[in-house]
């Protein structure tokens, strides 16, 4: 027999079927030119000393073989004795170590068997009624195909599925979608209506994330507020990476889970933008405001579950940075200014009503005044901080007020609103004899003492009614008692107490008259 022809003789080896799992497989035969054909196959197992024979049985029942030696590919013409217009059955017999191993058979019409290409280029993946839909453009001149898919997860081997017949310029496949694990898919095609024809190669992997992106398990810590009024948010624990199937472990697009940080600044609600979304890798600096932080996981199918944390406001207060002057026209606040053209947000809230919404005002961008101060004023009619109670005031600043992560805290302090001078006057002043020349003066705490850092000191004034001599005694804001000494018996005195703030002198309490009785000796 000539090597270019299919030999119609008994094969030159004895029949000793090994029945082993190794051997030739994946035989595919197709036309490669108008008169040329090719068959190729794979051989699994040790290749030393293996001889391959491509077998062919014609529709007449006559059978022949091509001896290919160690080669696993053979090209032949339509003159090789194999009928290309009629159905034939082909298989490979591999002879080694006195054993024969056979491939599965393929039955086809060689002339019609064109080598089909797998889906090429961009395979679009979408979700449709809880299933996965893949769509791609049909390779040129190959309309009319049968399509199969295979898929695996990180813990399972390949499973085969059918996409059904395709007969259009675009082809598609509905595949199972896993809820919680990533999958790798591959697709292959063959000519429609030629059951024995060869399958194309498998397509490149299509990596598909789980339907539900994983719950982000992360932890945050927030640093102390720095001198610039900002504090860094840091990630203490990275989100766990999704386990991927073998073919998706390189830079496989499509399977990635992206984590985003959604910041919601709860303080200063009157600013332009309260929420900002940024990549998790880009950990922001925050002002001292209260924030809600959510980590949102999403994949090609959209967002998944999120996890939310509350970052409380930094309550560290600056007792002296804010100056408030109350005039006939209204009230003005002064504080050390930031850079040119800075927008400030002034927020205040009665102490003890932290649950309620704070009042908030946004200034126009302003430059420092000649004294290097920034200001905010309001009229008495506005009623702002008009009630005689303690207010918590926070001032935030930003040169870019629309950028949420560029706000910083200027100061956080307390202020007693309304007529603080009168409202802060100490009540229930009482005088008790202490010794022959001293008395103890007590009073109820001023309302100002409920306002942290506002009450600078108490002043106790004692006036000798005979000589009109006056002495004043400063008392720590935490104390509500003082002892007055060196008093003379029989002399009438009046005592008054006032409560002072850093910027305001308090009003004196009602005068209390007392005298020390003259001791009469027996």
């Amino acid at each position: 027999c000539r090597t270019s022809e299919c030999c119609f003789q008994d094969p030159p080896y004895s029949d000793a079927d090994s029945g082993s799992a190794s051997g030739p497989r994946d035989l595919s035969c197709y036309r490669i030119s108008s008169a040329g054909y090719e068959c190729s196959w794979q051989y699994e197992g040790p290749t030393a000393g293996v001889s391959h024979f491509l077998r062919c049985c014609l529709s007449s029942g006559r059978c022949c073989y091509f001896a290919t030696g160690s080669a696993t590919r053979l090209q032949f013409s339509d003159q090789a004795g194999v009928s290309v217009l009629h159905t034939v059955t082909l298989w490979v017999e591999s002879w080694a170590r006195n054993r024969t191993e056979k491939s599965p058979e393929v039955t086809l019409q060689l002339y019609k068997s064109v080598k089909y290409k797998p889906p090429l280029g961009d395979i679009k993946v979408s979700k449709l009624a809880g299933q996965l839909r893949m769509e791609w453009e049909t390779p040129d001149n190959q309309v009319g195909a049968e399509v199969q898919f295979r898929h695996r997860t990180p813990s399972s081997s390949w499973k085969l599925g059918d996409c059904g017949p395709q007969d259009d310029d675009t082809e598609s496949c509905l595949c199972p979608l896993e809820m919680n694990v990533a999958q790798e898919f591959q697709l292959r095609r063959r000519r429609l209506g030629s059951q024995g024809s060869s399958w194309s190669k498998w397509s490149s992997p299509v990596c598909v994330p789980p339907e539900n992106p994983p719950q982000p398990q992360v932890r945050f810590s927030v640093e102390q507020l720095g001198r610039d009024g900002r504090r860094r948010l840091t990630l203490k624990e990275q989100p766990t990476q999704l386990e991927l199937p073998e073919g998706c472990q390189g830079p496989a697009p499509g399977v990635e889970v992206t984590y985003q940080l959604q910041l919601h600044m709860l303080s200063c609600p009157c600013k332009a933008k309260a929420t900002r979304t940024l990549p998790l890798e880009k950990m922001p600096y925050l002002s001292g405001a209260a924030y809600n932080v959510a980590v949102i996981s999403s994949n090609r199918f959209g967002p998944g579950p999120n996890q939310t944390w509350h970052i409380p406001a930094d309550t560290h207060t600056e007792p002296v940075a804010l100056n408030i002057s109350v005039g006939t026209n209204g009230t003005t606040m002064y504080w050390p200014a930031r850079a040119q053209s800075t927008t400030y947000c002034i927020e205040w809230q009665p102490v003890g009503q932290e649950g309620s919404l704070a009042t908030c005002n946004l200034t126009a961008p302003q430059d420092p005044d000649p004294a290097g101060m920034a200001t905010y004023s309001w009229s008495r009619e506005s009623g702002a901080m008009g009630q005689e109670k303690c207010y918590h005031i926070t001032i935030f600043a930003s040169a870019h007020p629309k950028k949420l992560t560029l706000w910083s805290t200027v100061l956080s302090t307390y202020h007693f609103g309304g007529n603080a001078s009168a409202a802060g006057t100490p009540h229930h002043v009482s005088v008790k004899n202490h010794s022959l020349d001293s008395v103890s003066v007590d009073w109820a705490p001023s309302l100002l003492s409920t306002c942290p850092g506002v009450l600078k000191e108490y002043v106790v004034r004692c006036r000798d009614e005979d000589s009109n001599q006056v002495s004043e005694h400063p008392v720590q804001p935490t104390e509500t008692q003082v002892t007055l000494s060196d008093l003379r018996a029989g002399v009438a005195y009046t005592v008054q107490v006032r409560a002072d703030t850093a910027w305001l002198r308090g009003a004196w309490s009602q005068p209390q008259r007392f005298s020390i009785k003259v001791q009469v000796s027996d």
Partner: nanobody, 125 residues
Framework: QVQLVESGGGLVQAGGSLRLSCAAS????????MGWFRQAPGQEREFVAA????????YYADSVKGRFTISRDNAKNTVYLQMNTLKPDDTAVYYC??????????????????WGQGTQVTVSS
């Protein structure tokens, strides 16, 4: 080797039908080309039909074409011969055969290395 047991033979009137079955045990059934042969009294054993391993391609002797159909069920390790429009000339012992390696022709009995005991088919006129 594979062991083969035929069943389904019997007496049938001309024009009737029979279905022969051949159950295989032993080696992997799907690795064999399966065939049916028959032998009438005083005659040589002759080829009737064969089916390739994948069950797609089938072959028939001219005398039975269009009347007989060979099929196989690899899951059940069984090959069948459906015989319709039977004639008295079809009277013979029908043998099931298995070829692990096909020679120069599917109909060549020397390719078949495993044989059943045979089942008698008698067609009366």
């Amino acid at each position: 080797q594979v062991q083969l047991v035929e069943s389904g033979g019997g007496l049938v009137q001309a024009g009737g039908s029979l279905r022969l079955s051949c159950a295989a045990s032993g080696r992997t059934f799907s690795s064999y080309v399966m065939g049916w042969f028959r032998q009438a009294p005083g005659q040589e054993r002759e080829f009737v039909a064969a089916i390739m391993r994948n069950g797609i391609m089938t072959y028939y002797a001219d005398s039975v074409k269009g009347r007989f159909t060979i099929s196989r069920d690899n899951a059940k390790n069984t090959v069948y011969l459906q015989m319709n429009t039977l004639k008295p000339d079809d009277t013979a012992v029908y043998y099931c055969a298995a070829a692990s390696r096909v020679g120069v022709s599917i109909s060549q009995s020397s390719s078949y290395t495993s044989w059943g005991q045979g089942t008698q088919v008698t067609v009366s006129s």
